[in-house]
C-alpha cells in the first residue's frame, strides 16, 4: 500500500524540546575536542555501549549514557603533521577516527582508527565482569590498520570479528581506490578480494558484514557483506549504483596457484528495492544505506531489513525492503553473470559449471574438498572470472514495505525489534534520518501476512540541531534505543505509552505493540500479564471492540500532533 507508505502521518510527532521535557531522550552532546560518534558496539552483558569517535573511545552505561568512561587515543604530532603536509584537513581528516570496534575475546575489544591517514589498531581491556570497571587502551601493542580501517574518515568499514579473525570491507590505500574485502588477524595469511578487477568490486561503499550459518555444519558458515557499488558498464545505461550482497566462506583460505591469498568463494548479487513507476519504468532505490538482520528461530534464516535511498538528485526518496535468506541462497545457486555477444552484454552463463560449484564452502557436506587450496584449477579460474550472479535478489513480496518520497529527509539507519502483542508478534522498525529524527514504524499484516501495512507510530527529533543519524543500536534488555551522529549520542526508550493519551480509545488507536490499556492508563504491554485485562488491537486499531468502557470520548479525530 504505497499511498499509505508515502503519506503516513505519525500518530505522535515529538520535537527535541518535547522529548527532553517528557524525559524521553538523554543526550551526550559530545566533547569539544571530539566528534563523529559513528562506530557502535553494544554489550548487553556488561550493560555498556562502546562508541568510537574522533580521537576517543567511549564506554556508556546502557541505563543512562550520562554515565560514561572515555579513552583518549589521538595520533602523534608527527603523524598529524605528515597528514597535513599530504594536503589533508587538520581538523576533519588529520585525527584518529575510530572505524572498527569489535569484541575480540571475553576481556578485550579490538579497535582500529584512521590514524590521520595511517590506519592503526589496538586492543582495549574491558575486564571479565561488568563490576571490574576496566576500560583501558593497550598502548604497548599497536598494529598496522591497513585493510582494517580506511585511511579516509569519510569512508566506512564493514567489519566482523569471529574466532580471532577480522573480516573487513574497506579501502586499503591512501588514495581510497583499492577497495577490498579482507580477512586479517588470526593465524592464517591475510586473504582479500582480487585487486584491480572491477568485476569483483567496482568502487564499493561497505555497509555491514554478518556471519550466517548455511547448515548445521559450522564448516559451511558464510560471511555476507552488504555494500553498494558502481554498476559495471553494460549492466546499466549511464552511471548507476547497485546495492549488493556478497558472500564468502568462513573457511576460504585462497587458491593453490591462482587466487593465492585471495577469496575463491566470493560471489555477489544485486539487491533490488523498487516500485513500479507510472510510465512502466520502475523507480529503483539503489543507494543502500543500512542493513539490520532480524534473527528468527532458525539461525540460518534471519530476515534482512535494508534501508535504501534513490540515486537521483531530482527525485528524493527512501525505502525499506525485506529479504529472505532462502531467496538470497537461491540466487547464489542460480546462473552466473557472463559477458558475451557482439555488445559484450551481461548474460546468464549457460556453459558447464565446474565441480564443486564456485561459491560452495569446502566441507564434509559437499564431497571431501577439505580446503579451498584443494580445489582444481578449473573451479578457481571460473570463480575468478565469474564473481557476480545474473539474477538479482528481489525483496519479500517483490516490493518495499515502506517508502517515503514526499519529505525533506532521507533514511539513513534501521534497527528492528520483534514485539509480542496481544494479537501476535510484530516487527517494530526504528528508522534514523539525515535530519536527526527517528521514525518508529510497525508492520501490520492486512488480509495475509505477506500483505503488510506500515503504521507510522512516532516521529521523534533526538538531536538539538538537524544532523545525520549514522549509528543505531537497540537494547532489548534495557528497552532503549541508542543513536549516534557527528554531534553526539542520544538515548531514548522504545516506548512512550503514557503520551498516547488518557483514554482506552486513544491507546487502542495508537496501534503501538508496546502499549495497551490496563484499565486506568496506557502502559507497557507484557504478554505474561493477565491478558484479558488489557485492551490492545494492533492489526485494526479498533477501540469499539476492545474498549468496553465506551471510552471513545478521547477525540478520535485528533492525531496528537505536537508542535
Amino acid at each position: 500500500n504505497y499511498a499509505n507508505g508515502k503519506n503516513n502521518v505519525p500518530r505522535l510527532k515529538l520535537s527535541y524540546k518535547e522529548m527532553l521535557e517528557s524525559n524521553n531522550v538523554i543526550t551526550f552532546n559530545g566533547l569539544a575536542n571530539s566528534s563523529s560518534y559513528h562506530t557502535f558496539l553494544l554489550d548487553e552483558e556488561r550493560s555498556r555501549l562502546y562508541v568510537g569517535a574522533k580521537d576517543h573511545i567511549f564506554s556508556f552505561n546502557l541505563v543512562n549514557i550520562k554515565d560514561f568512561q572515555k579513552i583518549v587515543w589521538p595520533v602523534s604530532y608527527t603523524r598529524r603533521d605528515e597528514c597535513k603536509w599530504a594536503g589533508k584537513d587538520i581538523l576533519k581528516e588529520c585525527a584518529n577516527f575510530i572505524k572498527v570496534l569489535k569484541a575480540y575475546n571475553q576481556t578485550h575489544l579490538y579497535a582500529c582508527g584512521t590514524g590521520a591517514f595511517h590506519p592503526i589498531c589496538t586492543y582495549i581491556e574491558v575486564g571479565h565482569h561488568p563490576e571490574d570497571n576496566i576500560f583501558k587502551l593497550q598502548d604497548s601493542h599497536f598494529e598496522n590498520g591497513r585493510g582494517k580501517s580506511p585511511y579516509d574518515p569519510k569512508l566506512l568499514t564493514a567489519s566482523l570479528l569471529i574466532d580471532g579473525e577480522l573480516y573487513s570491507g574497506t579501502a586499503a590505500d591512501f588514495m581510497g581506490r583499492d577497495f577490498a574485502i579482507f580477512r586479517t588477524l588470526g593465524h592464517h595469511h591475510p586473504i582479500r578480494t582480487e585487486q584491480h578487477d572491477s568485476r569483483w568490486l567496482n568502487d564499493p561503499r561497505f555497509i555491514s558484514a554478518h556471519l550466517i550459518p548455511e547448515s548445521d555444519n559450522p564448516e559451511d558458515d558464510k560471511v555476507y557483506f552488504f555494500f553498494r557499488e558502481n554498476a559495471i558498464d553494460g549492466e546499466h545505461s549511464g552511471k548507476a549504483t547497485h546495492a549488493r550482497i556478497g558472500q564468502i566462506c568462513k573457511n576460504d583460505f585462497g587458491g593453490h596457484r591462482s587466487l593465492v591469498n585471495k577469496w575463491t568463494t566470493f560471489l555477489k548479487a544485486r539487491l533490488i528495492c523498487s516500485v513500479p513507476g507510472p510510465n512502466g519504468i520502475d523507480t529503483h532505490f539503489d543507494e543502500l544505506q543500512d542493513v539490520f538482520l532480524m534473527n528468527s528461530k532458525d539461525p540460518k534464516n534471519p530476515i534482512v531489513y535494508g534501508v535504501f535511498t534513490t540515486s537521483s538528485n531530482i527525485f528524493k526518496g527512501s525505502a525499506v525492503c525485506m529479504y529472505s535468506m532462502s531467496d538470497v541462497r537461491r540466487v547464489f545457486l542460480g546462473p552466473y553473470a557472463h559477458r558475451d555477444g557482439p555488445n559484450y552484454q551481461w548474460v546468464p552463463y549457460q556453459g558447464r559449471v565446474p565441480y564443486p560449484r564456485p561459491g560452495t564452502c569446502p566441507s564434509k557436506t559437499f564431497g571431501g574438498f577439505d580446503s579451498t587450496k584443494d580445489l582444481p584449477d578449473d573451479v578457481i579460474t571460473f570463480a575468478r572470472s565469474h564473481p557476480a550472479m545474473y539474477n538479482p535478489v528481489f525483496p519479500i513480496n517483490n516490493r518495499p514495505i515502506m517508502i517515503k518520497t514526499d519529505v525533506n529527509y532521507q533514511f539513513t539507519q534501521i534497527v528492528v525489534d520483534r514485539v509480542d502483542a496481544e494479537d501476535g508478534q510484530y516487527d517494530v522498525m526504528f528508522i534514523g534520518t539525515d535530519v536527526g529524527t527517528v521514525l518508529k514504524v510497525v508492520s501490520v499484516p492486512k488480509e495475509t501476512w505477506h500483505d503488510l501495512e506500515e503504521v507510522l507510530l512516532e516521529e521523534m527529533t533526538v538531536f538539538r540541531e538537524p544532523t545525520t543519524i549514522s549509528a543505531m543500536e537497540l537494547s532489548t534488555k534495557q528497552q532503549q534505543l541508542y543513536i549516534g551522529s557527528t554531534a553526539g549520542v542520544a538515548q531514548l526508550p522504545l516506548h512512550r505509552c503514557d503520551i498516547y493519551g488518557k483514554a482506552c480509545a486513544e491507546c487502542c488507536l495508537a496501534r503501538d505493540p508496546y502499549c495497551a490499556w490496563d484499565g486506568s492508563s496506557c502502559s507497557r504491554y507484557f504478554p505474561t500479564a493477565k491478558a484479558r485485562t488489557r485492551a490492545q488491537d494492533i492489526r485494526n486499531g479498533d477501540p469499539l471492540t476492545h474498549c468496553s468502557d465506551g471510552g471513545i470520548e478521547g477525540r478520535m479525530d485528533h492525531h496528537h500532533h505536537h508542535h
Epitope: 564443486p356 577439505d370 580445489l375 584449477d377
Partner: antibody, heavy 117, light 107 residues
C-alpha cells in the same frame, strides 16, 4: 625420490572387469591429487580420471564415466582404477600420475590392458 | 570439451637447431597449459607447466610462452636426446585434454 608403480594390467575379454593398482612412495601421498592417463597403441595421450586428495570426489571424461571408478587408500599410499564393461577401445597402456589439480608432474612406467576376445 | 591442436605433426630438425612447437586451444584457457615429452617405450615427463613455468631438473633450453589460445614450446639448441614426441595438455577445465602430439625427429 618419487616412485609410482602400476600393476594389475593384463588380457581381458570385452565386457569384463579389471582393477589396476598404483603404489606410491617418496612423497606425501595424501597431499596430492592423483590421476590415470592412458595411451592406446601408436596413439596419443588420453586423460582417464582424477581423484582429489581426500578421495571424496573424482572426475571422469564421458568416454569412461559410469564404467571406471578411481579410488585411493591414503593409509596405504595406493591408487586404484576399477574398470568394468571393458571395450576393445580401452586397450592401452595405463599410467598412474601424480597431479591433476594442476599439472601432472610424475608418471609411472605404465601397465598394459588388452581387451580382446 | 576444449580441443588442442598441435602443429606441425612432425618436425624434422638437426641437433643444434632451434625447435618451435605450437599448440592452439579451441577456446581461451589463460595460462593453464602444460607441456610433456615422451620418448619411445617411456612414460611422459613434465617439461613446462602453466605455459611458461620451468620445472626443476629440466634443461634451460626448454621454454614455454603464450596465453589464451596460442602457445609455443621452444627448444633453443637441440640435443640428440630431445628427439621425441611432445604433447600439450590443458588444465583449464574438465575433461582435461591433450593435443595430438608433435613428433620431433632427426633430419
Amino acid at each position: 625420490e618419487v616412485q609410482l608403480v602400476e600393476s594389475g594390467g593384463g588380457l581381458v575379454q570385452p565386457g569384463g572387469s579389471l582393477r589396476l593398482s598404483c603404489a606410491a612412495s617418496g612423497f606425501t601421498f595424501s597431499s596430492y591429487y592423483m590421476s590415470w592417463v592412458r595411451q592406446a597403441p601408436g596413439k596419443g595421450l588420453e586423460w582417464v580420471s582424477t581423484i582429489i586428495k581426500s578421495g571424496g570426489y573424482a572426475y571422469y571424461p564421458d568416454s569412461v564415466k559410469d564404467r571406471f571408478t578411481i579410488s585411493r587408500d591414503n593409509s596405504k599410499n595406493t591408487l586404484y582404477l576399477q574398470m568394468s564393461s571393458l571395450r576393445a577401445e580401452d586397450t592401452a597402456v595405463y599410467y598412474c600420475v601424480r597431479g591433476g589439480q594442476g599439472a601432472m608432474d610424475y608418471w609411472g612406467q605404465g601397465t598394459t590392458v588388452t581387451v580382446s576376445s | 570439451e576444449i580441443v588442442l591442436t598441435q602443429s606441425p605433426a612432425t618436425l624434422s630438425l638437426s641437433p643444434g637447431e632451434r625447435a618451435t612447437l605450437s599448440c592452439r586451444a579451441s577456446q581461451s584457457i589463460g595460462d593453464y597449459l602444460h607441456w610433456y615429452q615422451q620418448k619411445p617405450g617411456q612414460a611422459p615427463r613434465l617439461l613446462i607447466k602453466y605455459a611458461s613455468q620451468s620445472i626443476s631438473g629440466i634443461p634451460a633450453r626448454f621454454s614455454g610462452s603464450g596465453s589464451g589460445t596460442d602457445f609455443t614450446l621452444t627448444i633453443t639448441s637441440l640435443e640428440p636426446e630431445d628427439f621425441a614426441v611432445y604433447y600439450c595438455q590443458q588444465g583449464y577445465s574438465f575433461p582435461y585434454t591433450f593435443g595430438g602430439g608433435t613428433k620431433l625427429e632427426i633430419k
